[in-house]
């Protein structure tokens, strides 16, 4: 603790100019004071002034009023500082002395004589209020007041509480009268060292190092740190949690970088071809007759559509073609015959019927044969009747479609939902794809059916095939294989033309 006992001398009266021994001062009592402050004693005794002592210069002669003086010699009130916890009790001895010597340093003069002394014993609380008193004896009267106040930065009933106002890294506060801290605006905490963040700043996602600030933790953004940041590789997606990549409408793939509406956005197919949003590049062009190429940009030979009938040979010309007909045929496409039924033109048991008064004929073919002369065996699979990759097989007069897994129906046109039987374990999400069901596994599980629990760095073993990139950190304990074009599967192990970069999670 630290404080100051202050004594204000107000008036001293010694009308007769007498000393304590009854003698008179000549020419008058040139008066100075000695003050001794010590711990409380029921009976005041000589001995050290344990709380401090002080002397004044000569303040006047015989009777005088003592003016307040704040500096230099003769300072009033008198200051008795102490460096301990104020006990609340004290003993005070005030002695008035006459000196024949130096006004300013009368203590040092020989021949000083006691005029009078007073002793005060009692209790005194720390406070700003002065306690006023007056002591009389037969010859003198002393008016005075006193108090105990705390030194700068000390507070409390005993001046034992240290508080120094500050505004720096260690705290931002002022001191209350009792020494408790009063935080400056924008600061809080026991030592006022915690800033009060911007109102509404998210408690978990945000923090601050100074008032009214809101600094976001990794993965969060915005004024209040309540908006997430999408994954670093994300292209056309958003997030609801940090580092997610939820695709915008019309985009797909692990990083939302595949245009699901490529046909609409880019019109890649030329020469009147049909564009569909599928295939390894995100689109496929179906060309009109006479065109080829990835974008149907290449014109085919005019003969490519085999326009010449009845065995005629085709020759390309600048903007057209020419059919060279075999013997017995004529016309632009060798479609007219010079033969008649007499020439037995119908093969494979076909029946000949004369037309145009016998100048031409038509063949009626038996089952399984076709062509103008019944020369072709019917291939019932030429029209590609089997959908969804089914295999067409000729069976005598009919044909059947052998369907791929997941499809049924006469033409394999019906899709069987493999997900109906819930093949994915541990809460995996099932996707019906051409090759059968595929499971997207939750965090911590892998395998084609999410049956394997992961307990290690999933990418460490290099699980992805065919040049696929392995990712961890998208969700705990899982890896994701981002497949190159032309490969699918949880590890990109299957070379199948499924939609690219489906997020296969192992």
């Amino acid at each position: 603790g630290s404080g100051i006992f202050q004594l204000r001398l107000q008036e001293f009266v010694n009308q007769r100019g007498m000393l304590a021994n009854g003698q008179s001062c000549e020419p008058g009592c040139r008066t100075f004071f000695r003050i001794c402050l010590k711990h409380f004693q029921a009976t005041f005794s000589e001995g050290p002034c344990t709380f401090g002592n002080v002397s004044t210069p000569v303040l006047g002669t015989n009777s005088f009023v003592v003016r307040d003086k704040n500096s230099g010699s003769g300072r009033n009130p008198l200051q008795l500082p102490f460096n301990f916890t104020w006990p609340g009790t004290f003993s005070l001895n005030i002695q008035a002395w006459h000196t024949p010597g130096d006004d300013l340093r009368p203590e040092t003069s020989p021949g000083n004589s006691l005029i009078s002394q007073i002793i005060i014993q009692g209790s005194l609380a720390v406070g700003k209020i002065w306690r006023t008193d007056e002591q009389n004896d037969t010859l003198t009267r002393l008016s005075y007041s006193y108090r105990v106040i705390c030194s700068d930065n000390y507070y409390g009933e005993s001046c034992s509480r240290l508080c120094k106002k500050r505004d720096d890294h260690f705290g931002h506060y002022e001191c209350q009268p009792d020494g408790s801290l009063s935080c400056l605006p924008g600061w809080t905490g026991k030592y006022c060292d915690q800033p009060i963040c911007l109102s509404g700043c998210h408690e978990q996602n945000g923090y601050c190092s100074k008032p009214d600030e809101c600094i976001c933790r990794p993965g969060w953004q915005g004024r209040l740190c309540n908006e997430c940041i999408p994954h670093n590789g994300c292209r056309h997606g958003t997030c609801s949690i940090p580092w997610q990549c939820a695709c915008d409408e019309g985009w797909g793939g692990l990083f939302c970088d595949q245009d699901l509406n490529y046909c609409t956005h880019h019109s890649p197919c030329k020469n009147g071809s049909t564009c569909s949003n599928s295939g390894p590049k995100g689109y496929t062009c179906t060309c009109l007759p006479g065109y080829t190429g990835e974008h149907c940009e290449l014109g085919l030979s005019k003969c490519a559509s085999n326009p010449c009938r009845n065995g005629g040979s085709c020759k390309d010309q600048e903007n057209s073609y020419h059919c060279l007909c075999p013997p017995g045929y004529y016309g632009q496409h060798c479609e007219h015959s010079t033969l008649t039924c007499a020439d037995s033109p119908c093969f494979n048991g076909g029946s000949c019927r004369e037309r145009n008064q016998g100048s031409s004929y038509a063949c009626e073919c038996p089952p399984n044969f076709t062509g103008s002369n019944c020369e072709k065996k019917v291939d019932r699979c030429t029209s590609n009747p089997c959908a969804n990759g089914g295999q067409c097989q000729n069976r005598g007069p009919s044909r059947t479609c052998r369907c791929r897994p997941g499809f049924t129906g006469t033409h394999c046109e019906l899709h069987i939902s493999d997900c109906a039987r819930s093949p994915c374990a541990h809460g995996g999400t099932c996707h019906d794809l051409e090759n059968g069901p595929v499971c997207t596994c939750p965090a911590g599980f892998s395998g084609r059916r999410c049956e394997v629990r992961i307990t290690h760095d999933a990418c460490a073993s290099g699980p992805c095939f065919n040049g696929a990139t392995c990712y961890t950190g998208l969700s705990p304990n899982n890896f994701v294989c981002n497949c190159p074009y032309g490969f699918v599967g949880s590890r990109c192990e299957f070379p199948v033309g499924l939609p690219p970069s489906f997020p296969w999670v192992a």
Epitope: G219, Q221, G222, E227, N232, R235
Partner: antibody, heavy 118, light 107 residues
Framework: EVQLVESGGGLVQPGGSLRLSCAAS????????MAWVRQAPGKGLEWVAT????????YYRDSVKGRFTISRDNAKNSLYLQMNSLRAEDTAVYYC???????????WGQGTLVTVSS | DIQMTQSPSSLSASVGDRVTITCRAS??????LAWYQQKPGKAPKLLIF???NLADGVPSRFSGSGSGTDFTLTISSLQPEDFATYYC?????????FGQGTKLEIK
């Protein structure tokens, strides 16, 4: 393909102003926070400013606060840096980058040189 | 601000060598660290984020490790195109700060 193309750099006197632009393509610009990062000749990289995608909140390094302003126009897929009261120590190649102050800078532009000299 | 210190500031190596670059943070940044590669006259390119995650299209010969204050970038078998300057960056604390760079030169 993600592309960031800066423009607007050049020679300017101390105390002068310059406005840098960054044209973004290949990603949904409005979904992502953006930043400016600079590199003084022969020196390392230094983050300058960031703007959020959600509400346009801005942050600046202390040495440019009050002098530089980062802004964005989502309709034009563009990021801007208005630089006022330029100083010699602002001389650098300024890169437009996709990222925030608390995330990696995933994509960068080719940079534009700003020279502050009398 | 967090100080990021890279070492060495430069190093010479040959094609096929295994190379390690270290980065030390002045305080804990957890795993919020990225590595960038920069070639002369070009923009930096993100190699690794979150200490050990490879950015899209980055060859698997690059790897990262560490946590807290000490981190490493390793190139398992140097290729001719790997000679460049490498920077680490922390994004755990505001403001983000970069290391001073490590120049990888051909021996």
């Amino acid at each position: 393909e993600v592309q960031l193309v800066e423009s607007g750099g050049g020679l300017v006197q101390p105390g002068g102003s310059l406005r840098l632009s960054c044209a973004a393509s290949g990603f949904t610009f409005s979904n992502f926070p953006m930043a400016w990062v600079r590199q003084a000749p022969g020196k390392g990289l230094e983050w300058v400013a960031t703007i959020s995608s959600s509400d346009g909140t801005t942050y600046y390094r202390d040495s440019v606060k009050g002098r530089f302003t980062i802004s964005r126009d989502n309709a034009k897929n563009s990021l801007y840096l208005q630089m006022n009261s330029l100083r010699a120590e602002d001389t650098a190649v300024y890169y437009c980058a996709r990222g925030y102050y608390n995330s990696p800078f995933a994509y960068w532009g080719q940079g534009t040189l700003v020279t502050v000299s009398s | 601000d967090i100080q990021m210190t890279q070492s060495p500031s430069s190093l010479s190596a040959s094609v096929g060598d295994r190379v390690t670059i270290t980065c030390r943070a002045s305080e804990d940044i957890y795993s919020n660290l990225a590595w960038y590669q920069q070639k002369p006259g070009k923009a930096p390119k993100l190699l690794i984020f979150d200490t050990n995650n490879l950015a899209d299209g980055v060859p698997s010969r690059f790897s990262g490790s560490g946590s807290g204050t000490d981190f490493t970038l390793t190139i398992s078998s140097l290729q001719p195109e790997d000679f460049a300057t490498y920077y680490c960056q922390q994004y755990n604390n505001y403001p983000p700060t970069f290391g001073q760079g490590t120049k990888l030169e051909i021996k």
